[in-house]
Interface confidence: low
């Protein structure tokens, strides 16, 4: 063999024994009849040698190191050549090393032609035996950026101050090109930037510098991911350790497309973003470590790029073109642990503008899609106003309070659908008639349906909540004096299946003075629980409500109050209750602030319960709970 190195080439060739094998027969380099085990050839030298055995590859390795000095003169940028050519070298396992030294202000970029590189961890090896070991430099300290195989996603690595690249080729490998080029860049102001390019679906495992040892103190390392727009990327941390910080905090920062809060900063222990569309950056920032007990910062993570999951590539049409005074908001559900980050979850309009909240308004048709790993993290809130400005036009008019089918077909759970029902003051009132009779939610008989109607006053100054009502009870209708909001609130995904049970009609009726009237038609053998509005806060001052309770001809109703006294203490006025038989008009009047509440009473005919409040003293509110039970009229209880 003959190796001749040109003058000024800054190349050194070293042939030395490799890892010792248990081969019985030793092997030597033979030069001028001398038997040696190591040979060094420098620039300008020409040496002829041979080996004393037939399979020198089992004994020796060759290292070819080229020093590139960018400090004193111009850098030889461009495609890097294998020098000397592999055809001139003995067939030994060979390592080509390029050691580039540059000023701190100079950025150096290694560009890898296809196939790109795949980073491997400690203990891993490359299938074809070809490995790329890349190191950087911080002052005099060498920092290992990583070891890489072929057939990956890493296309470029940018560093500053210097780079050492070692390409290891097995003796049998035919490769005769370096596969990379060097370019100069402006200062990157960090340890390194690794660019990872995905052409299609795939994954990449990447590691912090020096992994599995500690990341250099107070350093910054960035990974840039290039992802086709039609694919989605998710990041998961496979392994990490935190050091003991004296100043600053160790963290990762993301530049995420569509995020209004770039950079997004997370702790390493947080859940990392998922389902990101398009290119994004991830940076690892170290801290100033405790000198006595520094610990180590290290990170191994995976980026998974795949086609959009589930709903992400579906377009949904939300047709609000025939709606008026309506807005639909899709937004994140409130999460308990606000410090924990969860993967990105976006809703997109026309598949282009994506955000975590989206409000659609009536009068248009909207095309939306979702960019979210888990759609249960979103919900919908809808508001619709039905107002009557002219009582002559509205009286006796009816509107169906039904969730439009377009909304039910969306893959996001409906949380609230609120109808604001507005009437001209002192001119009209409202009546709500459900498709299925309603049950009032009480502690004694809670609703267990997938949705309820929450009925409350919509007059800003009035704090009046009539209650929560669900299908399957005895309340036939609810009449209210003035503006109210009716909110259909869902409690379970099964609402989709039970949606047919929803159905409430509102009609504008002549004005009446009572705050509310509940029409109750109890079913036989079921106990109906009823309670005054504003339960737990007390019926508002000077408010009057009534219950119109029907008793079938062959039944008797038992009216039971659940307290001995109402508990109300009046500041001004009187609180009273009237129980009036509808047939005979006979009535009993009870002073709620003085009398005990009536014992259970039996009613053979339909009757009224009317409760009117005084102005109570604070803390002594009027809250009443009562029940009505029907039993067959077998004996004459009078």
């Amino acid at each position: 063999f003959e190796i001749a190195l040109p003058r000024e080439s800054n190349i050194t060739v070293l042939i030395k024994l490799g890892t010792p094998t248990l081969l019985a027969k030793p092997c030597y380099i033979v030069i001028s009849k001398r038997h040696i085990t190591m040979l060094s050839i420098k620039s300008g030298e020409r040496i002829v040698f041979t080996f004393s055995c037939q399979s020198p590859e089992n004994h020796f390795v060759i290292e070819i190191q080229k020093n590139i000095d960018c400090m004193s003169g111009p850098c030889p940028f461009g495609e890097v050549q294998l020098q000397p050519s592999t055809s001139l070298l003995p067939t030994l396992n060979r390592t080509f090393i390029w050691d580039v030294k540059a000023h701190k202000s100079i950025g150096l970029e290694l560009q890898f032609s296809i196939p790109r590189l795949r980073q491997i961890g400690p203990g891993e090896s490359c299938p074809d035996g070809v490995t790329h070991s890349i190191s950087g430099r911080i002052d005099a300290t060498v920092v290992r950026i990583g070891t890489f195989c072929s057939n990956g996603t890493v296309s470029r690595i940018k560093m500053q101050e210097g780079v050492k690249m070692a390409l290891h080729l097995p003796w049998f490998h035919p490769r005769n090109v370096s596969g990379f080029s060097i370019a100069n860049r402006s200062s990157i102001k960090r340890l390194c930037i690794i660019e990872s390019v995905f052409e299609g679906e795939g994954s990449a495992t990447l590691m912090s510098a020096n992994y599995p040892e500690g990341f250099p103190e107070d350093e910054l390392m960035t990974w840039q991911f290039v992802v086709p727009a039609h694919l989605r990327a998710s990041v998961s941390f496979l392994n990490f350790n935190l050091s003991n910080c004296e100043r600053k905090e160790e963290r990762v920062e993301y530049y995420i497309p569509g995020s209004t809060t770039n950079p997004e900063v997370f702790k390493l222990e947080d859940k990392q973003p998922g389902n990101m569309a398009g290119n994004f950056n991830l940076s690892l920032q170290g801290c100033d470590q405790d000198a006595q007990s520094p610990g180590i910062l290290r990170l191994q993570f995976q980026v998974l790029v795949q086609h959009p999951q589930n709903e992400s590539n579906k377009i949904y049409v939300v047709d609000l073109s025939n709606e008026r005074a309506m807005s639909l908001t899709i937004e994140p559900r409130p999460v308990k642990q606000s410090r924990k980050f969860v993967p990105g979850c976006f809703v997109c309009l026309e598949s282009r503008t994506c955000s975590s909240n989206l409000t659609l308004t009536s009068g248009s048709k909207h095309k939306i899609s979702f960019l979210c790993d888990d759609l249960t993290r979103l919900w919908m809130n809808v508001e619709k106003t039905i107002s009557c400005t002219d009582h002559r036009y509205c009286q006796r008019k009816s509107y169906s309070l039904q969730v439009p089918s377009d909304i039910l077909h969306l893959p996001v759970e409906l949380h609230d659908f609120s109808w604001k029902l507005l009437v001209p003051k002192d001119r009209l009132s409202l009546v709500l008639v459900p498709a299925q009779k309603l049950q009032q939610h009480t502690h004694e008989k809670p609703c267990n349906t997938s949705f309820s109607y929450l009925v409350a006053s919509a007059i800003p100054s009035q704090d009046l909540y009539f209650g929560s009502f669900c299908p399957g009870g005895s309340i036939k209708q609810i009449q209210v004096k003035q503006n109210i909001s009716v909110t259909l609130r869902t409690f379970a995904p099964s609402f989709q299946q039970e949606a047919s049970r929803q159905g409430l009609t509102v009609s504008f009726i002549p004005y009446f003075k009572e705050e509310g009237v509940f029409t109750v038609t109890p079913d036989t053998k079921s106990k109906v629980y009823l309670r005054t509005p504003n339960w737990d806060r007390g019926l508002p001052s000077l408010t009057s409500v009534s219950w119109n309770i029907s008793v079938p001809r062959d039944q008797v109703a038992c009216l039971t109050f659940f307290k001995e006294r109402s508990g109300v203490v009046c500041q001004t006025g009187r609180a009273f209750m009237i129980i009036q038989e509808q047939r005979t008009r006979a009535e009993e009047i009870f002073s709620l602030d003085e009398d005990v509440l009536p014992k259970p009473s039996f009613h053979h005919h339909s009757f009224w319960v009317n409760i009117s409040n005084c102005s109570p003293t604070s803390g002594k509110q009027l809250d009443l709970l009562f029940s009505v039970t029907l039993t067959p009229r077998t004996v004459d209880l009078t």
Epitope: K314, I315, Y316, V317, D319, S321, N322, K365, K367, S405, L408, H409, Q496, Q497, A499, S500
Partner: antibody
């Protein structure tokens, strides 16, 4: 390949009922909405409504509320159209058609079922 | 509801000629308009979606244009198999409606 196979022609008397079927194959029924379209003899196409194949919720056009019912049996990938109290003006070809991702254009159609109502 | 008016009701052309079919909506429907072809005794077939988007498997001689309330279906050079009835369909809001159709017949 995607196919919508509809049941055969029906001859009915006024006042009777009929149930038409549409079998979906080559795709998962619940991934796409199913629409029904009517075409009276020598006339144009009239959209009757659609059924959400995931939830089973039907939506009817105003002219088809009352006597027309859309239903599904997802276990056998079938969609059905039932018409009760048939009238002579119900004589038409009834098509089932697949809606793309709730996006109302119909990329696949059944071959149609002719319903003739005559005394 | 959206009313779609197609014109002409009948279009008589010879093979090789250019066909221009019009569809006008009673109000602006953006690009929510689709075109279908129906041959005698057959089911309709989707030709163009969203006014101008081509459909896989449909010959390139079929193209659509328009937005708002005026739409056009163009057949650049009519082939013998193109003689059929063509319907436009609005997908803007419930109920979805079809035009009354344009019959393309051999001259």
């Amino acid at each position: 390949q995607v196919q919508l196979q509809q049941s055969g022609s029906e001859l009915k008397k006024p006042g009777e009922s009929v149930k038409l079927s549409c079998k979906a194959s080559g795709y998962t029924l619940t991934d796409f909405s199913m629409h029904w379209v009517r075409q009276a003899p020598g006339q144009g196409l009239k959209w009757m409504g659609w059924i959400n194949t995931e939830t089973g919720a039907p939506t009817y056009a105003d002219d088809f509320k009352g006597r027309f019912v859309f239903s599904l049996d997802t276990s056998v990938s079938m969609a059905y159209l039932q018409i009760s109290s048939l009238k002579s003006e119900d004589t038409a070809v009834y098509y089932c058609s697949r809606g793309r991702d709730y996006d109302p254009h119909f990329d696949y159609w059944g071959q149609g079922t002719l319903v003739t109502v005559s005394s | 509801e959206i009313v779609l008016t197609q014109s002409p009701a009948t279009l008589s052309l010879s093979p090789g000629e250019r066909a221009t079919l019009s569809c006008r909506a009673s109000q602006s429907i953006s690009d929510f308009l689709h075109w279908y072809q129906q041959k005698s005794g057959q089911s309709p077939r989707l030709l163009i979606k969203y006014a101008s988007q081509s459909i896989s498997g449909i010959p390139a001689r079929f193209s659509g244009s328009g937005s708002g309330s005026d739409f056009t279906l163009t057949i650049s050079s009519v082939e013998p198999e193109d003689f059929a009835v063509y319907y436009c369909q609005s997908a803007h809001s419930f109920p979805y409606t079809f035009g009354q159709g344009t019959k393309l017949e051999i001259k």
